[in-house]
Structures are given as structure tokens and as C-alpha cells.
Interface confidence: low
């Protein structure tokens, strides 16, 4: 027989010869990093037809690294489902926790022993420092010094010293996020007050009030013979300006060769029209608003035209 077969997990005991006699036996041992588990044979014999009898290295098993427990509030995931040397261990933390240490450890061979490349990481609870304080406002849980994952705080504005209230600009609720950062910037509290919107040759059909604060919404209708140039609905924005701008009511021109559409009591159907959002503040009117036949709005005797909650 010629030289005996070579294997990944076991090696020949002694030096190989150029050829072997029929009936001659060779023995193998497990390579470094592998260990023998009986009963499979680790030897072979030169057969009379000049071939080696079948043998495999299935009896030699890779050394494995020590078992790693799941970190508290996390998981240790063997990359290939095995702890054998040459493979990796991945660490993941549960939601609301973050990893301190190496995310991946390698099972390495040191001498004939398989050991991990480092110390297993730990999973620490996601914590946020207190959210920012805001001028003219406060948030809930202001006495708490440390916030946990998904803890929420809600901002509100202080009572204003003057006649006009502070309005909350932005989202009132923020959450402690998974990277220990609050979910968004804190809102601001400031006085937002828009000028009384005057539309000549037209009238308000909703949003009656003496003062117009943040998000106050006003809707207009033009008098008979006039049409609306602009949006029928305007909203008081955070800069104390109307958005879109206050519309105009323009006179319907007498018909020429082409007839314009009938625009009596018309309301713009512009696609930019904002959905009417009820004013968040502002005193209720003490006077009777003008009667409107605008479709979808009740007459005054049927109830107030808009909710100014």
C-alpha cells in the first residue's frame, strides 16, 4: 500500500513510510484540539488488494469551550449551534437593556484547551437622564432622577402671568428610548396669539372667539356675489401667523363669453385645506354668531358651531 490516508481531526502515529506490506497496520491519534471518544477504530490495515481498510476520523471530536449561561436579561447564541473551537458566540440583550462588553466571543485553542476569547458581556438596563426642563412649563415625574426604558413624561405649560395662556408647541409626551435617548426633543411653551382675521365681503362660519391662540382654526364663507380666493380654513400656527394666510373674498365678475361657476356662498375646495382642528384654548363667545347655512354645520339654535375645548 502507498501512504495511508490523512484526516482533518486525526494524525498518524510515527513517520509515514513510502510503502507498506500487506497486513501491516498503522495507528492514528486525535490531533491537538480534538479528543477521542470510543469505540470507533483509529487504525487501519493494508489489505491484500493493496488498499487501506476503511477508517474515519469520526471518533475525534473538537474540543469545546466552557458552557456560557445566558447573561441576565439577555441571550447567548452559539453562531453555529456549537461550542466547538473555531466558532463564535453572539450575545443579545432583551428589549430595554444594552450590552456592555464584547458582542461576539470566539472559541479559541490555547495549547490543547479550548477557551473563550474574552469575558462574557453583561446586559444593563437602559436608563435615561431626566428630560430637559422647559421654559414656562414642566413635565411629569420631575422628581425622578433616573428613567427606565419606555418610561414616558408629559409636558404641560404653566399658567401665564398675563391675559394670554402659554401654548404647548410640539408633542407633549416623550419616551425613554432604547439608546438611552429621549424619543424626541422637548416641546416649548410660549404665548401664541394670532390677529383677528378679517375678511371683507365674507364671514366666519366656525372658530368664533375674541382671541385666537395656537391651533385655533377659523373657517370662512363669502357673501353672495363673492368667491373665496385662498383656503376656507386657516390655523393659528406657532409663529402667531395664520396658515394658510387669511383668504380674500373677490367679487364675481359679470358673465362674459364663458360663464364662471356659480360661487354664491362658495367655500374653497382646495386640496390644501387643513382639516379643522378645534381651538385648544380661548374664551367661548358671549355673543350669538351669525347664522350660517354652510352644509354640515348646525344652525345656532341646534348647538354651538364648533367645540372650543
Amino acid at each position: 500500500c502507498e501512504e495511508p490516508p490523512t484526516f482533518e481531526a486525526m494524525e498518524l502515529i510515527g513517520k509515514p513510510k513510502p510503502y507498506y506490506e500487506i497486513g501491516e497496520r498503522v495507528d492514528y491519534k486525535c490531533k491537538k484540539g480534538y479528543f477521542y471518544i470510543p469505540p470507533l477504530a483509529t487504525h487501519t490495515i493494508c489489505d491484500r488488494n493493496h488498499t487501506w481498510l476503511p477508517v474515519s476520523d469520526d471518533a475525534c471530536y473538537r474540543e469545546t469551550c466552557p458552557y456560557i449561561r445566558d447573561p441576565l436579561n439577555g441571550q447567548a447564541v452559539p453562531a453555529n449551534g456549537t461550542y466547538e473551537f473555531g466558532y463564535q458566540m453572539h450575545f443579545i440583550c432583551n428589549e430595554g437593556y444594552y450590552l456592555i462588553g464584547e458582542e461576539i466571543l470566539y472559541c479559541e485553542l490555547k495549547g490543547s484547551v479550548a477557551i473563550w476569547s474574552g469575558k462574557p458581556p453583561i446586559c444593563e438596563k437602559v436608563l435615561c437622564t431626566p428630560p430637559p426642563k422647559i421654559k414656562n412649563g414642566k413635565h411629569t415625574f420631575s422628581e425622578v432622577e433616573v428613567f427606565e426604558y419606555l418610561d414616558a413624561v408629559t409636558y404641560s405649560c404653566d399658567p401665564a402671568p398675563g391675559p394670554d395662556p402659554f401654548s404647548l408647541i410640539g408633542e407633549s409626551t416623550i419616551y425613554c428610548g432604547d439608546n438611552s435617548v429621549w424619543s424626541r426633543a422637548a416641546p416649548e411653551c410660549k404665548v401664541v396669539k394670532c390677529r383677528f382675521p378679517v375678511v371683507e365681503n365674507g364671514k366666519q362660519i366656525s372658530g368664533f372667539g375674541k382671541k385666537f391662540y395656537y391651533k385655533a382654526t377659523v373657517m370662512f364663507e363669502c357673501d353672495k356675489g363673492f368667491y373665496l380666493d385662498g383656503s376656507d380654513t386657516i390655523v393659528c400656527d406657532s409663529n402667531s401667523t395664520w396658515d394658510p394666510p387669511v383668504p380674500k373674498c373677490l367679487k364675481v365678475l359679470p358673465p362674459s363669453s364663458t360663464k364662471p361657476p356659480a360661487l354664491s356662498h362658495s367655500v374653497s375646495t382646495s386640496s390644501t385645506t387643513k382639516s379643522p382642528a378645534s381651538s385648544a384654548s380661548g374664551p367661548r363667545p358671549t355673543y350669538k354668531p351669525p347664522v350660517s347655512n354652510y352644509p354640515g354645520y348646525p344652525k345656532p339654535e341646534e348647538g354651538i358651531l364648533d367645540s372650543l375645548d
Epitope: Y149, G170, Y175, R184, S278, A280, D309
Partner: antibody, heavy 116, light 109 residues
Framework: QVQLVQSGGGVVQPGRSLRLACAAS????????MHWVRQAPGKGLEWVAV????????YYADSVKGRFTISRDNSKNTLYLQMNSLRAEDTAVYYC?????????WGRGTLVTVSS | QSVLTQPPSVSGAPGQRVTISCTGS?????????VHWYQQLPGTAPKLLIY???NRPSGVPDRFSGSKSGTSASLAITGLQAEDEADYYC?????????FGGGTKLTVL
């Protein structure tokens, strides 16, 4: 695997009591606010109650106030809903859910039928 | 009667874009509280689809998007697929109470 496992549903007569449980596996519920949400057959979702992560704050829907009690045992990683003076209109699938302003993990639900 | 109003049903053909509206008031959505969206496939528990008005949890395709303006919000689904057929619920908050819309049944034609 992170999941909420519910138990305790069944058929009960009007005026009687029932306790639902929601056990968390793969996560520690003592870090989270927990809610109960219900869904009557063929209807939409209705929020029932919430308890803060430490159990100190509880809120209830008006429809169950004074009859239902939400509680938690953080050592057992379990949320409870004690339902007393049950009415026919309490018949629903009850879900437990985790989260603060929103519910990012739900149990599979347990059916409560109130019938004589 | 739900405090948040949704259309009872919407439909669209595969590949199309559909939107579902959710209308609240100045005491919930209009007061600055976030809007969240849930998908409920037949016979299963609801699943978070959009949180904080326009954020997607991991695993939710970018075909789903949310927006909020004033007292209302909407969910848009582009490139409609057969597996999107489900009930969709919007949700928000008002003083000590979590709110849900009445739900919208999406049918993929």
C-alpha cells in the same frame, strides 16, 4: 422567545367573578407598564386598564371602574385582571399588552363569556 | 361609539396605494398626543404597525407609513399586497385613558 402567555378565561354567569393572568417569558415585566385591552365579538378594540411598572399607578376605563382591578406580581413576572360583578357586555377576548403610550407586545388573548 | 373616528372599510387592488384616516379632537390627538396604528390579521392578536405618529417598529415594511396633522392622522399603505388584508386600528391618549378608533377593514381586491 419573548411572549405574553394568557390564562383564566372561560364562561361565567352575570354577577360572578373571574381572574385573568398574563405571564411573561423572555422579558421581565417589572420594567414595563402593562395594559389590558378587550375586543367584543365582531367589534373593535377597547382599552380596559393599565398599571405602571412598579404597580403604584393604575388607570381604568369608565366602563369597568369599580368592578375590575389590575395588579401585578413582579416576582412571578405576571399581570392580573380581577373582574367582579361581570355583565353580559363584558363578553370579549381580553388581551394583555406591554408598553407605555403604545402596545408593542400583545398576548394571544383569552375569551371571557358572561352568560346565564 | 369610538372617540377616534375611522372609515369602516377601504379597499384596493394589489400594487395600489390606500390611506386610512383617524379623526380625533382637541382633547386627544389635537392636544399633542401621539397616534399609533395596529394591524389585526384575522383570528390573531393586534400587532404594532406604527408608533409615535410615523415610526415603524423593526420588521414592519416601509410600505407602511403614518402621519399626523392637527386633530387627525392617517395610515398609508403603498404597493398593496394580499397579506395586508386585515383590520387596522388607530390609537391615542387623553387624560388617563388610552383610546382606539373603531377599526377599518382593508380588503385587497
Amino acid at each position: 422567545q419573548v411572549q405574553l402567555v394568557q390564562s383564566g378565561g372561560g364562561v361565567v354567569q352575570p354577577g360572578r367573578s373571574l381572574r385573568l393572568a398574563c405571564a411573561a417569558s423572555g422579558l421581565t415585566v417589572n420594567n414595563y407598564a402593562m395594559h389590558w385591552v378587550r375586543q367584543a365579538p365582531g367589534k373593535g378594540l377597547e382599552w380596559v386598564a393599565v398599571i405602571s411598572y412598579d404597580g403604584n399607578n393604575k388607570y381604568y376605563a369608565d366602563s369597568v371602574k369599580g368592578r375590575f382591578t389590575i395588579s401585578r406580581d413582579n416576582s412571578k413576572n405576571t399581570l392580573y385582571l380581577q373582574m367582579n360583578s361581570l355583565r353580559a357586555e363584558d363578553t370579549a377576548v381580553y388581551y394583555c399588552a406591554k408598553g407605555g403610550g403604545y402596545f408593542d407586545l400583545w398576548g394571544r388573548g383569552t375569551l371571557v363569556t358572561v352568560s346565564s | 361609539q369610538s372617540v377616534l373616528t375611522q372609515p369602516p372599510s377601504v379597499s384596493g387592488a394589489p400594487g395600489q396605494r390606500v390611506t386610512i384616516s383617524c379623526t380625533g379632537s382637541s382633547s386627544n390627538i389635537g392636544a399633542g398626543y401621539d397616534v399609533h396604528w395596529y394591524q389585526q390579521l384575522p383570528g390573531t392578536a393586534p400587532k404594532l404597525l406604527i408608533y409615535g405618529n410615523n415610526n415603524r417598529p423593526s420588521g414592519v415594511p416601509d410600505r407602511f407609513s403614518g402621519s399626523k396633522s392637527g386633530t387627525s392622522a392617517s395610515l398609508a399603505i403603498t404597493g398593496l399586497q394580499a397579506e395586508d388584508e386585515a383590520d387596522y386600528y388607530c390609537s391615542s391618549y387623553t387624560s388617563g385613558t388610552w383610546l382606539f378608533g373603531g377599526g377599518t377593514k382593508l380588503t385587497v381586491l
